[in-house]
Protein backbone atom coordinates (compact mmCIF):
# COMPACT_ATOMS: atom_id res chain seq x y z
CA UNK A 1 0.00 0.00 0.00
CA UNK A 2 1.76 3.50 -0.71
CA UNK A 3 2.04 6.00 1.76
CA UNK A 4 0.76 9.46 1.46
CA UNK A 5 1.81 12.51 3.61
CA UNK A 6 -0.27 15.68 3.76
CA UNK A 7 0.10 19.03 4.96
CA UNK A 8 -3.54 20.34 7.36
CA UNK A 9 -4.81 23.64 4.65
CA UNK A 10 -2.61 21.72 1.67
CA UNK A 11 -3.68 20.18 -1.04
CA UNK A 12 -2.80 16.50 -2.17
CA UNK A 13 -2.62 14.87 -5.20
CA UNK A 14 -3.32 10.93 -4.90
CA UNK A 15 -1.94 9.30 -7.93
CA UNK A 16 -3.88 6.11 -9.96
CA UNK A 17 -3.15 5.10 -13.03
CA UNK A 18 -3.99 2.47 -15.72
CA UNK A 19 -1.96 0.68 -18.38
CA UNK A 20 -4.18 1.39 -21.13
CA UNK A 21 -3.17 4.88 -21.92
CA UNK A 22 -6.98 5.91 -22.76
CA UNK A 23 -9.92 7.18 -21.09
CA UNK A 24 -11.56 4.58 -18.99
CA UNK A 25 -14.71 4.12 -16.36
CA UNK A 26 -12.80 4.64 -12.60
CA UNK A 27 -13.41 5.91 -9.26
CA UNK A 28 -12.40 7.03 -5.94
CA UNK A 29 -13.85 5.47 -2.46
CA UNK A 30 -12.53 5.67 1.24
CA UNK A 31 -12.29 3.00 3.56
CA UNK A 32 -15.37 3.27 3.86
CA UNK A 33 -17.05 1.94 0.72
CA UNK A 34 -18.41 5.84 0.61
CA UNK A 35 -17.43 7.20 -3.14
CA UNK A 36 -15.90 10.28 -3.42
CA UNK A 37 -15.81 10.66 -6.94
CA UNK A 38 -15.97 8.79 -10.45
CA UNK A 39 -16.46 9.26 -14.25
CA UNK A 40 -20.15 8.90 -15.84
CA UNK A 41 -19.37 9.78 -19.84
CA UNK A 42 -17.17 12.85 -20.02
CA UNK A 43 -18.47 14.05 -16.84
CA UNK A 44 -16.62 14.13 -12.81
CA UNK A 45 -19.40 12.91 -10.99
CA UNK A 46 -19.27 13.40 -6.90
CA UNK A 47 -20.50 10.63 -4.51
CA UNK A 48 -21.94 11.68 -0.79
CA UNK A 49 -18.72 11.42 0.80
CA UNK A 50 -17.40 14.28 3.19
CA UNK A 51 -14.51 14.93 0.65
CA UNK A 52 -17.06 15.38 -1.95
CA UNK A 53 -16.65 19.48 -1.77
CA UNK A 54 -13.24 19.24 -2.00
CA UNK A 55 -11.70 16.66 -4.28
CA UNK A 56 -11.32 17.02 -7.65
CA UNK A 57 -9.82 15.55 -10.69
CA UNK A 58 -7.99 16.70 -13.77
CA UNK A 59 -9.82 15.31 -17.01
CA UNK A 60 -7.03 16.41 -19.48
CA UNK A 61 -4.98 12.90 -17.60
CA UNK A 62 -7.12 11.02 -17.81
CA UNK A 63 -6.35 10.06 -21.88
CA UNK A 64 -3.12 9.65 -20.30
CA UNK A 65 -4.74 6.71 -18.39
CA UNK A 66 -3.81 9.01 -14.80
CA UNK A 67 -7.12 9.08 -13.08
CA UNK A 68 -5.72 11.33 -9.89
CA UNK A 69 -7.84 12.44 -6.89
CA UNK A 70 -6.61 16.02 -5.93
CA UNK A 71 -7.61 16.55 -2.67
CA UNK A 72 -8.43 20.74 -1.67
CA UNK A 73 -7.98 22.28 2.22
CA UNK A 74 -6.56 19.07 3.73
CA UNK A 75 -7.91 18.26 7.08
CA UNK A 76 -6.45 15.88 9.76
CA UNK A 77 -9.37 13.78 9.09
CA UNK A 78 -8.75 13.13 5.66
CA UNK A 79 -6.22 10.73 6.79
CA UNK A 80 -7.83 7.23 5.39
CA UNK A 81 -6.66 4.52 3.23
CA UNK A 82 -8.06 5.66 -0.21
CA UNK A 83 -9.36 2.66 -2.91
CA UNK A 84 -8.89 4.05 -6.74
CA UNK A 85 -10.76 1.04 -8.78
CA UNK A 86 -9.94 0.71 -12.04
CA UNK A 87 -9.90 -1.49 -14.56
CA UNK A 88 -11.10 -3.99 -12.85
CA UNK A 89 -8.05 -3.60 -10.47
CA UNK A 90 -8.07 -1.42 -6.98
CA UNK A 91 -5.00 0.67 -5.84
CA UNK A 92 -4.60 1.07 -2.08
CA UNK A 93 -3.33 4.72 -0.55
CA UNK A 94 -2.95 5.66 2.84
CA UNK A 95 -3.44 9.31 3.16
CA UNK A 96 -1.64 10.92 6.71
CA UNK A 97 -2.41 14.50 7.32
CA UNK A 98 -0.67 16.77 9.76
CA UNK A 99 -0.40 19.53 11.05
CA UNK A 100 2.74 22.22 13.15
CA UNK A 101 1.31 25.09 14.63
CA UNK A 102 2.95 27.13 17.12
CA UNK A 103 1.39 27.51 20.61
CA UNK A 104 1.18 31.17 21.05
CA UNK A 105 2.23 34.00 18.88
CA UNK A 106 4.74 33.42 16.57
CA UNK A 107 6.10 37.11 17.72
CA UNK A 108 7.59 36.33 20.87
CA UNK A 109 9.86 38.24 23.01
CA UNK A 110 13.90 37.68 23.55
CA UNK A 111 14.16 35.17 26.32
CA UNK A 112 10.47 33.73 26.31
CA UNK A 113 9.53 30.10 24.72
CA UNK A 114 8.31 28.61 21.94
CA UNK A 115 6.67 25.32 21.61
CA UNK A 116 4.88 23.65 17.93
CA UNK A 117 2.46 21.34 18.37
CA UNK A 118 2.10 18.44 16.03
CA UNK A 119 -1.54 17.53 14.74
CA UNK A 120 -1.46 13.76 13.34
CA UNK A 121 -4.32 11.18 12.95
CA UNK A 122 -4.65 8.42 15.35
CA UNK A 123 -2.23 5.65 15.24
CA UNK A 124 0.62 7.53 13.77
CA UNK A 125 3.99 7.77 15.44
CA UNK A 126 5.39 10.71 13.54
CA UNK A 127 9.35 12.11 14.55
CA UNK A 128 9.62 16.22 14.16
CA UNK A 129 12.97 17.65 13.58
CA UNK A 130 12.98 21.48 13.59
CA UNK A 131 16.09 23.48 12.00
CA UNK A 132 16.11 27.02 13.04
CA UNK A 133 17.22 29.96 11.13
CA UNK A 134 20.63 29.74 12.67
CA UNK A 135 21.42 25.93 12.34
CA UNK A 136 19.94 24.78 15.51
CA UNK A 137 18.43 21.52 15.59
CA UNK A 138 16.07 20.28 17.69
CA UNK A 139 13.83 16.72 17.69
CA UNK A 140 10.99 16.02 19.77
CA UNK A 141 7.84 13.82 19.35
CA UNK A 142 4.02 15.34 19.37
CA UNK A 143 5.84 19.19 20.77
CA UNK A 144 8.99 20.94 20.09
CA UNK A 145 9.87 23.25 22.74
CA UNK A 146 12.67 26.33 22.59
CA UNK A 147 13.14 27.52 26.19
CA UNK A 148 14.69 30.52 25.38
CA UNK A 149 14.06 32.54 22.32
CA UNK A 150 17.63 34.27 21.23
CA UNK A 151 17.34 37.37 18.28
CA UNK A 152 18.98 34.70 16.49
CA UNK A 153 16.50 32.38 15.94
CA UNK A 154 14.04 35.38 14.25
CA UNK A 155 13.26 34.04 10.96
CA UNK A 156 11.88 30.93 9.40
CA UNK A 157 11.91 27.39 11.07
CA UNK A 158 11.78 24.48 8.80
CA UNK A 159 10.79 21.22 10.38
CA UNK A 160 9.80 17.98 8.73
CA UNK A 161 7.84 15.00 9.88
CA UNK A 162 8.67 11.57 9.14
CA UNK A 163 6.29 8.53 9.18
CA UNK A 164 7.10 5.55 7.45
CA UNK A 165 10.10 6.41 5.56
CA UNK A 166 8.44 9.50 4.44
CA UNK A 167 8.93 12.88 4.90
CA UNK A 168 6.61 16.60 4.83
CA UNK A 169 7.89 19.91 5.26
CA UNK A 170 6.54 22.84 7.43
CA UNK A 171 7.78 26.41 7.16
CA UNK A 172 7.01 28.82 10.45
CA UNK A 173 7.90 32.19 10.24
CA UNK A 174 9.07 33.16 14.05
CA UNK A 175 9.47 36.91 14.68
CA UNK A 176 12.19 37.17 17.84
CA UNK A 177 10.79 41.07 19.10
CA UNK A 178 14.07 42.34 20.61
CA UNK A 179 16.69 45.28 20.06
CA UNK A 180 19.38 44.65 17.22
CA UNK A 181 22.27 44.82 19.70
CA UNK A 182 21.84 43.68 23.72
CA UNK A 183 24.61 46.23 24.49
CA UNK A 184 26.40 49.19 22.85
CA UNK A 185 28.74 52.08 23.86
CA UNK A 186 29.19 55.36 22.95
CA UNK A 187 32.51 57.29 23.49
CA UNK A 188 32.70 60.93 23.57
CA UNK A 189 35.53 63.68 24.61
CA UNK A 190 33.35 66.41 27.25
CA UNK A 191 31.66 69.03 25.50
CA UNK A 192 30.39 66.98 22.36
CA UNK A 193 26.82 66.01 21.19
CA UNK A 194 26.08 62.37 22.32
CA UNK A 195 23.67 59.81 19.90
CA UNK A 196 22.25 56.81 21.45
CA UNK A 197 20.54 54.66 18.93
CA UNK A 198 18.48 52.04 19.25
CA UNK A 199 17.50 49.89 16.22
CA UNK A 200 15.02 47.23 16.96
CA UNK A 201 15.81 43.66 14.97
CA UNK A 202 12.07 43.24 13.90
CA UNK A 203 9.40 45.46 11.42
CA UNK A 204 5.91 45.04 12.73
CA UNK A 205 3.06 46.57 10.73
CA UNK A 206 1.82 48.05 13.76
CA UNK A 207 4.39 49.02 16.48
CA UNK A 208 2.64 50.50 19.63
CA UNK A 209 3.94 50.19 23.71
CA UNK A 210 5.88 52.88 25.71
CA UNK A 211 9.57 52.70 27.13
CA UNK A 212 11.66 54.25 29.21
CA UNK A 213 15.25 54.74 29.88
CA UNK A 214 16.73 54.65 33.28
CA UNK A 215 20.20 55.71 33.97
CA UNK A 216 23.29 54.90 36.19
CA UNK A 217 25.60 57.65 36.31
CA UNK A 218 29.16 56.67 37.45
CA UNK A 219 29.13 59.17 39.94
CA UNK A 220 25.94 58.91 41.53
CA UNK A 221 24.46 56.65 44.30
CA UNK A 222 21.19 55.67 42.13
CA UNK A 223 19.83 54.96 39.11
CA UNK A 224 17.67 58.34 37.64
CA UNK A 225 14.95 57.82 34.89
CA UNK A 226 15.89 60.07 32.07
CA UNK A 227 12.65 60.24 29.70
CA UNK A 228 9.64 58.31 29.52
CA UNK A 229 7.79 57.62 25.92
CA UNK A 230 4.95 56.30 24.06
CA UNK A 231 5.17 54.26 20.49
CA UNK A 232 2.09 54.71 18.67
CA UNK A 233 1.97 53.26 15.27
CA UNK A 234 5.90 53.79 14.89
CA UNK A 235 5.28 57.37 16.17
CA UNK A 236 7.20 58.08 18.78
CA UNK A 237 6.61 60.98 21.94
CA UNK A 238 7.91 62.03 24.72
CA UNK A 239 5.71 61.70 28.17
CA UNK A 240 8.08 63.10 30.89
CA UNK A 241 12.11 64.11 30.65
CA UNK A 242 14.46 65.58 33.37
CA UNK A 243 15.51 68.90 33.41
CA UNK A 244 19.15 67.63 34.03
CA UNK A 245 20.05 66.08 31.46
CA UNK A 246 17.47 67.50 29.17
CA UNK A 247 17.17 64.71 26.46
CA UNK A 248 15.75 65.20 23.12
CA UNK A 249 14.09 61.86 21.41
CA UNK A 250 13.03 61.57 17.53
CA UNK A 251 9.58 61.09 16.54
CA UNK A 252 10.72 57.96 14.06
CA UNK A 253 12.02 54.75 14.32
CA UNK A 254 14.37 53.42 15.21
CA UNK A 255 14.65 55.04 18.53
CA UNK A 256 17.34 57.86 18.90
CA UNK A 257 17.70 60.11 21.84
CA UNK A 258 20.46 63.31 21.83
CA UNK A 259 22.22 64.30 24.61
CA UNK A 260 23.40 68.08 24.00
CA UNK A 261 26.65 67.96 25.64
CA UNK A 262 28.58 64.90 27.28
CA UNK A 263 29.56 65.82 30.80
CA UNK A 264 31.41 63.41 33.27
CA UNK A 265 28.58 63.52 35.59
CA UNK A 266 26.88 62.23 32.87
CA UNK A 267 29.15 58.93 31.86
CA UNK A 268 27.81 55.65 33.16
CA UNK A 269 25.56 53.08 32.11
CA UNK A 270 21.56 53.17 31.01
CA UNK A 271 18.50 50.71 30.59
CA UNK A 272 16.45 51.74 27.57
CA UNK A 273 13.48 49.29 28.19
CA UNK A 274 10.11 48.99 25.64
CA UNK A 275 7.18 47.53 26.39
CA UNK A 276 4.70 46.22 23.33
CA UNK A 277 0.96 46.55 23.25
CA UNK A 278 -0.51 42.43 23.84
CA UNK A 279 2.61 41.42 24.62
CA UNK A 280 3.96 40.69 28.38
CA UNK A 281 7.54 41.37 29.34
CA UNK A 282 10.16 43.65 27.87
CA UNK A 283 12.44 44.14 25.63
CA UNK A 284 16.03 45.72 26.62
CA UNK A 285 18.57 47.40 25.50
CA UNK A 286 21.94 48.52 27.45
CA UNK A 287 23.62 51.67 26.39
CA UNK A 288 27.17 52.93 27.82
CA UNK A 289 28.78 56.72 27.64
CA UNK A 290 32.27 57.04 28.43
CA UNK A 291 33.45 60.56 28.15
CA UNK A 292 36.97 62.19 28.49
CA UNK A 293 38.31 65.16 29.14
CA UNK A 294 42.12 66.47 28.90
CA UNK A 295 42.83 69.64 30.78
CA UNK A 296 46.03 71.14 32.32
CA UNK A 297 46.39 72.62 35.06
CA UNK A 298 50.02 74.38 36.30
CA UNK A 299 52.64 71.81 35.46
CA UNK A 300 49.92 68.78 35.62
CA UNK A 301 48.53 67.64 32.23
CA UNK A 302 45.78 65.06 32.95
CA UNK A 303 43.57 62.89 30.84
CA UNK A 304 40.45 61.23 32.64
CA UNK A 305 37.92 59.09 31.58
CA UNK A 306 34.59 58.40 33.14
CA UNK A 307 31.81 55.64 32.70
CA UNK A 308 32.18 51.98 32.17
CA UNK A 309 35.45 51.11 30.78
CA UNK A 310 36.89 47.28 30.70
CA UNK A 311 40.34 47.14 33.14
CA UNK A 312 42.07 45.58 29.54
CA UNK A 313 41.43 49.23 28.05
CA UNK A 314 44.79 51.51 27.75
CA UNK A 315 44.38 55.25 28.32
CA UNK A 316 47.66 57.09 26.62
CA UNK A 317 48.96 60.62 26.69
CA UNK A 318 51.00 60.81 23.57
CA UNK A 319 53.03 64.15 22.17
CA UNK A 320 52.43 64.52 18.53
CA UNK A 321 55.68 63.75 16.75
CA UNK A 322 57.42 62.82 19.68
CA UNK A 323 57.87 59.56 21.18
CA UNK A 324 56.71 61.20 24.88
CA UNK A 325 54.26 58.67 26.05
CA UNK A 326 52.89 57.72 28.66
CA UNK A 327 49.99 54.80 28.83
CA UNK A 328 48.09 53.09 31.65
CA UNK A 329 45.52 50.55 32.25
CA UNK A 330 43.53 53.31 34.35
CA UNK A 331 40.97 55.96 34.14
CA UNK A 332 43.74 58.73 34.68
CA UNK A 333 47.49 59.40 33.30
CA UNK A 334 49.26 62.72 33.75
CA UNK A 335 52.53 64.41 32.85
CA UNK A 336 54.40 66.54 34.90
CA UNK A 337 55.83 69.64 33.53
CA UNK A 338 54.68 68.41 29.98
CA UNK A 339 56.74 69.67 27.03
CA UNK A 340 55.16 72.29 24.69
CA UNK A 341 53.33 70.86 21.66
CA UNK A 342 50.18 69.09 20.51
CA UNK A 343 49.14 66.33 23.55
CA UNK A 344 46.88 63.15 22.07
CA UNK A 345 45.01 61.36 24.84
CA UNK A 346 43.99 58.20 23.45
CA UNK A 347 41.73 55.62 24.83
CA UNK A 348 42.36 51.98 22.81
CA UNK A 349 41.76 48.85 22.94
CA UNK A 350 44.31 46.81 21.45
CA UNK A 351 45.67 48.98 19.84
CA UNK A 352 42.31 50.11 18.34
CA UNK A 353 41.75 53.83 19.30
CA UNK A 354 38.22 54.53 20.88
CA UNK A 355 38.16 57.96 21.65
CA UNK A 356 40.78 60.73 21.34
CA UNK A 357 41.00 64.51 22.34
CA UNK A 358 44.13 67.00 22.01
CA UNK A 359 45.56 69.38 23.91
CA UNK A 360 47.80 72.12 22.96
CA UNK A 361 50.25 73.22 25.65
CA UNK A 362 52.60 76.02 25.11
CA UNK A 363 55.70 77.01 27.03
CA UNK A 364 56.03 78.72 30.10
CA UNK A 365 58.95 81.60 29.74
CA UNK B 1 -4.57 33.84 -0.20
CA UNK B 2 -1.96 32.62 -2.86
CA UNK B 3 -0.42 35.07 -5.08
CA UNK B 4 2.22 34.98 -7.85
CA UNK B 5 4.63 37.19 -8.99
CA UNK B 6 6.40 36.92 -11.90
CA UNK B 7 10.05 38.39 -13.20
CA UNK B 8 12.71 37.93 -15.95
CA UNK B 9 14.07 39.83 -18.83
CA UNK B 10 11.76 41.93 -20.85
CA UNK B 11 13.62 42.49 -24.00
CA UNK B 12 15.66 40.03 -26.32
CA UNK B 13 17.08 39.25 -29.59
CA UNK B 14 16.18 36.93 -31.86
CA UNK B 15 17.93 33.37 -31.01
CA UNK B 16 18.33 34.11 -27.49
CA UNK B 17 16.64 32.10 -24.74
CA UNK B 18 13.71 34.19 -22.59
CA UNK B 19 14.18 33.20 -19.12
CA UNK B 20 10.95 33.66 -16.25
CA UNK B 21 10.91 32.84 -12.86
CA UNK B 22 6.88 32.38 -11.48
CA UNK B 23 7.20 33.01 -7.19
CA UNK B 24 4.29 31.40 -5.46
CA UNK B 25 3.72 32.96 -2.27
CA UNK B 26 0.92 31.52 0.09
CA UNK B 27 -1.27 28.78 -0.14
CA UNK B 28 -0.56 25.30 -1.41
CA UNK B 29 2.47 24.45 -3.39
CA UNK B 30 1.89 20.79 -4.09
CA UNK B 31 -1.54 18.98 -5.65
CA UNK B 32 -1.72 21.68 -8.05
CA UNK B 33 -0.28 22.18 -11.77
CA UNK B 34 1.63 25.39 -12.17
CA UNK B 35 1.47 26.80 -15.95
CA UNK B 36 2.57 29.23 -18.52
CA UNK B 37 0.33 31.29 -20.79
CA UNK B 38 0.80 34.08 -23.68
CA UNK B 39 -0.69 36.10 -25.45
CA UNK B 40 0.83 38.25 -28.16
CA UNK B 41 -0.34 42.68 -28.64
CA UNK B 42 -3.93 42.20 -29.44
CA UNK B 43 -4.60 38.72 -29.38
CA UNK B 44 -6.10 35.63 -27.83
CA UNK B 45 -3.90 33.58 -25.04
CA UNK B 46 -2.05 30.73 -25.72
CA UNK B 47 -0.97 27.93 -23.27
CA UNK B 48 2.78 27.05 -22.86
CA UNK B 49 2.50 24.43 -20.74
CA UNK B 50 2.67 23.30 -16.94
CA UNK B 51 4.60 21.54 -14.34
CA UNK B 52 3.87 19.38 -10.60
CA UNK B 53 5.82 20.49 -7.55
CA UNK B 54 7.31 16.68 -8.21
CA UNK B 55 8.64 17.73 -12.05
CA UNK B 56 5.89 16.21 -13.88
CA UNK B 57 5.64 18.88 -17.15
CA UNK B 58 3.10 18.71 -19.90
CA UNK B 59 3.27 21.20 -22.32
CA UNK B 60 2.22 22.54 -26.00
CA UNK B 61 2.83 20.29 -28.70
CA UNK B 62 3.43 23.97 -31.10
CA UNK B 63 6.41 24.50 -28.58
CA UNK B 64 7.70 21.56 -26.95
CA UNK B 65 10.96 21.80 -28.78
CA UNK B 66 11.82 24.86 -27.44
CA UNK B 67 10.14 24.94 -24.16
CA UNK B 68 11.51 24.01 -20.51
CA UNK B 69 9.67 24.13 -17.53
CA UNK B 70 11.46 23.92 -14.07
CA UNK B 71 10.34 23.85 -10.41
CA UNK B 72 12.23 24.79 -7.10
CA UNK B 73 9.67 23.48 -4.43
CA UNK B 74 12.60 24.91 -1.51
CA UNK B 75 11.42 28.44 -3.11
CA UNK B 76 8.06 27.70 -3.98
CA UNK B 77 9.39 29.22 -7.42
CA UNK B 78 8.83 27.60 -10.82
CA UNK B 79 10.57 29.12 -14.15
CA UNK B 80 10.15 28.94 -17.81
CA UNK B 81 12.77 29.12 -20.67
CA UNK B 82 12.05 29.21 -24.39
CA UNK B 83 14.91 29.01 -26.32
CA UNK B 84 16.03 30.68 -30.27
CA UNK B 85 12.92 33.15 -29.97
CA UNK B 86 11.93 34.78 -33.20
CA UNK B 87 9.49 38.01 -33.21
CA UNK B 88 6.65 36.12 -33.32
CA UNK B 89 7.75 35.43 -29.28
CA UNK B 90 6.45 38.95 -28.62
CA UNK B 91 3.89 38.51 -25.90
CA UNK B 92 3.22 39.36 -22.37
CA UNK B 93 3.51 35.91 -20.34
CA UNK B 94 1.43 35.10 -17.71
CA UNK B 95 2.69 32.42 -14.87
CA UNK B 96 -1.11 30.89 -12.97
CA UNK B 97 -1.91 27.92 -11.25
CA UNK B 98 -4.06 25.17 -12.53
CA UNK B 99 -6.41 22.52 -11.79
CA UNK B 100 -8.35 22.47 -15.07
CA UNK B 101 -8.98 26.26 -14.74
CA UNK B 102 -6.43 29.14 -14.39
CA UNK B 103 -6.47 30.88 -11.02
CA UNK B 104 -4.58 33.24 -9.94
CA UNK B 105 -2.76 34.71 -12.34
CA UNK B 106 0.10 36.66 -11.72
CA UNK B 107 0.81 40.02 -13.14
CA UNK B 108 2.43 39.17 -16.74
CA UNK B 109 5.46 40.34 -18.24
CA UNK B 110 5.91 41.81 -21.73
CA UNK B 111 8.93 40.06 -23.24
CA UNK B 112 9.81 41.81 -26.69
CA UNK B 113 11.57 40.15 -28.89
CA UNK B 114 13.76 42.58 -31.90
CA UNK B 115 16.99 43.11 -33.09
CA UNK C 1 -6.14 19.86 -30.76
CA UNK C 2 -9.53 21.14 -29.83
CA UNK C 3 -10.18 24.38 -31.38
CA UNK C 4 -12.50 26.67 -29.35
CA UNK C 5 -14.49 29.54 -31.42
CA UNK C 6 -16.20 31.97 -29.80
CA UNK C 7 -19.21 34.54 -31.07
CA UNK C 8 -19.58 37.58 -31.76
CA UNK C 9 -16.20 38.63 -31.44
CA UNK C 10 -17.15 41.67 -30.52
CA UNK C 11 -20.33 43.14 -29.05
CA UNK C 12 -22.08 46.60 -28.42
CA UNK C 13 -24.08 46.73 -25.52
CA UNK C 14 -25.42 49.44 -22.30
CA UNK C 15 -25.40 49.19 -19.05
CA UNK C 16 -28.51 47.71 -17.94
CA UNK C 17 -28.35 45.26 -20.96
CA UNK C 18 -28.51 41.25 -21.16
CA UNK C 19 -25.85 39.99 -22.92
CA UNK C 20 -25.06 36.46 -23.98
CA UNK C 21 -21.68 35.09 -25.46
CA UNK C 22 -21.12 31.69 -26.89
CA UNK C 23 -18.88 29.74 -27.33
CA UNK C 24 -18.35 26.27 -29.54
CA UNK C 25 -15.62 22.93 -28.93
CA UNK C 26 -14.82 21.30 -32.24
CA UNK C 27 -15.27 17.87 -29.95
CA UNK C 28 -17.46 16.78 -26.99
CA UNK C 29 -15.99 18.13 -23.79
CA UNK C 30 -18.42 17.77 -21.22
CA UNK C 31 -18.96 20.39 -18.95
CA UNK C 32 -15.20 21.05 -19.05
CA UNK C 33 -15.09 24.55 -20.15
CA UNK C 34 -14.42 27.74 -17.96
CA UNK C 35 -15.00 31.60 -18.71
CA UNK C 36 -12.35 34.34 -17.98
CA UNK C 37 -12.82 38.46 -18.07
CA UNK C 38 -9.79 40.38 -19.32
CA UNK C 39 -9.34 43.57 -19.04
CA UNK C 40 -6.56 46.01 -21.14
CA UNK C 41 -3.42 45.79 -19.48
CA UNK C 42 -4.58 42.97 -16.65
CA UNK C 43 -4.24 39.44 -16.36
CA UNK C 44 -7.76 37.42 -17.30
CA UNK C 45 -9.50 36.13 -13.81
CA UNK C 46 -11.85 33.44 -13.31
CA UNK C 47 -15.35 33.99 -13.96
CA UNK C 48 -17.15 30.30 -14.39
CA UNK C 49 -15.73 26.74 -14.21
CA UNK C 50 -17.32 23.47 -14.98
CA UNK C 51 -19.45 25.38 -17.69
CA UNK C 52 -22.07 26.42 -15.00
CA UNK C 53 -19.94 26.99 -11.37
CA UNK C 54 -19.46 30.59 -10.14
CA UNK C 55 -16.09 31.14 -8.66
CA UNK C 56 -16.78 32.78 -5.18
CA UNK C 57 -16.89 36.20 -5.35
CA UNK C 58 -18.37 37.06 -8.68
CA UNK C 59 -21.13 38.62 -9.05
CA UNK C 60 -24.64 36.73 -9.56
CA UNK C 61 -25.20 38.60 -12.73
CA UNK C 62 -22.46 36.32 -14.52
CA UNK C 63 -23.94 33.19 -15.03
CA UNK C 64 -22.93 30.11 -17.28
CA UNK C 65 -24.53 27.11 -19.38
CA UNK C 66 -23.91 24.26 -21.52
CA UNK C 67 -22.58 21.31 -22.08
CA UNK C 68 -20.92 19.15 -24.67
CA UNK C 69 -20.01 21.32 -27.78
CA UNK C 70 -22.14 24.37 -26.97
CA UNK C 71 -21.32 26.95 -24.03
CA UNK C 72 -23.41 29.86 -23.07
CA UNK C 73 -21.87 32.91 -21.35
CA UNK C 74 -24.85 35.46 -19.52
CA UNK C 75 -24.45 38.81 -17.96
CA UNK C 76 -28.19 39.54 -16.88
CA UNK C 77 -28.16 43.21 -16.47
CA UNK C 78 -24.40 44.77 -17.52
CA UNK C 79 -22.58 47.09 -14.81
CA UNK C 80 -19.94 49.71 -16.02
CA UNK C 81 -17.16 47.62 -14.90
CA UNK C 82 -18.44 44.58 -16.82
CA UNK C 83 -16.86 46.11 -20.52
CA UNK C 84 -13.89 44.07 -21.23
CA UNK C 85 -12.96 40.63 -23.04
CA UNK C 86 -14.10 37.35 -22.44
CA UNK C 87 -12.70 34.48 -23.12
CA UNK C 88 -13.59 30.61 -22.68
CA UNK C 89 -11.12 27.56 -22.33
CA UNK C 90 -11.91 24.03 -22.00
CA UNK C 91 -9.78 21.11 -19.83
CA UNK C 92 -11.01 18.28 -21.85
CA UNK C 93 -7.76 17.60 -23.29
CA UNK C 94 -3.64 19.03 -23.79
CA UNK C 95 -2.82 21.26 -25.12
CA UNK C 96 -5.83 22.94 -23.28
CA UNK C 97 -7.31 26.25 -25.92
CA UNK C 98 -8.86 29.08 -25.18
CA UNK C 99 -11.41 31.04 -27.91
CA UNK C 100 -10.39 34.22 -29.52
CA UNK C 101 -12.25 36.01 -27.42
CA UNK C 102 -15.12 38.60 -27.06
CA UNK C 103 -14.75 42.03 -26.23
CA UNK C 104 -17.71 43.72 -24.88
CA UNK C 105 -18.29 47.06 -25.51
CA UNK C 106 -19.97 50.21 -24.76
CA UNK C 107 -22.46 51.08 -27.08
Known amino acids: KKVVLGKKGDTVELTCNASQKKNTQFHWKNSNQIKILGIQGLFLTKGPSKLSDRADSRKSLWDQGCFSMIIKNLKIEDSDTYICEVENKKEEVELLVFGLTANSDTHLLEGQSLTLTLESPPGSSPSVKCRSPGGKNIQGGRTISVPQLERQDSGTWTCTVSQDQKTVEFKIDIVVLAFQKASSTVYKKEGEQVEFSFPLAFTLEKLTGSGELWWQAERASSSKSWITFDLKNKEVSVKRVTQDPKLQMGKKLPLHLTLPQALPQYAGSGNLTLALEAKTGKLHQEVNLVVMRATQFQENLTCEVWGPTSPKLTLSLKLENKGATVSKQAKAVWVLNPEAGMWQCLLSDSGQVLLESNIKVVPTW | QVQLQQWGAGLLKPSETLSLTCDVY????????WTWIRQPPGKGLEWIGEINHSGTTNSNPSLKSRVTISVDTSKSQFSLRLSSVTAADTAVYFC?????????WGQGTLVTVSS | DIQMTQSPSSVSASVGDRVTITCRASQDIANWLAWYQQKPGKAPQLLIYAASSLLGGVPSRFSGSGSGADFTLTISSLHPEDFATYYC?????????FGQGTKLEIK
Open chain 3, 89 to 97: QQANSFPYT
Open chain 2, 96 to 104: TRELNWFDP
Open chain 2, 26 to 33: GGSFSGYY
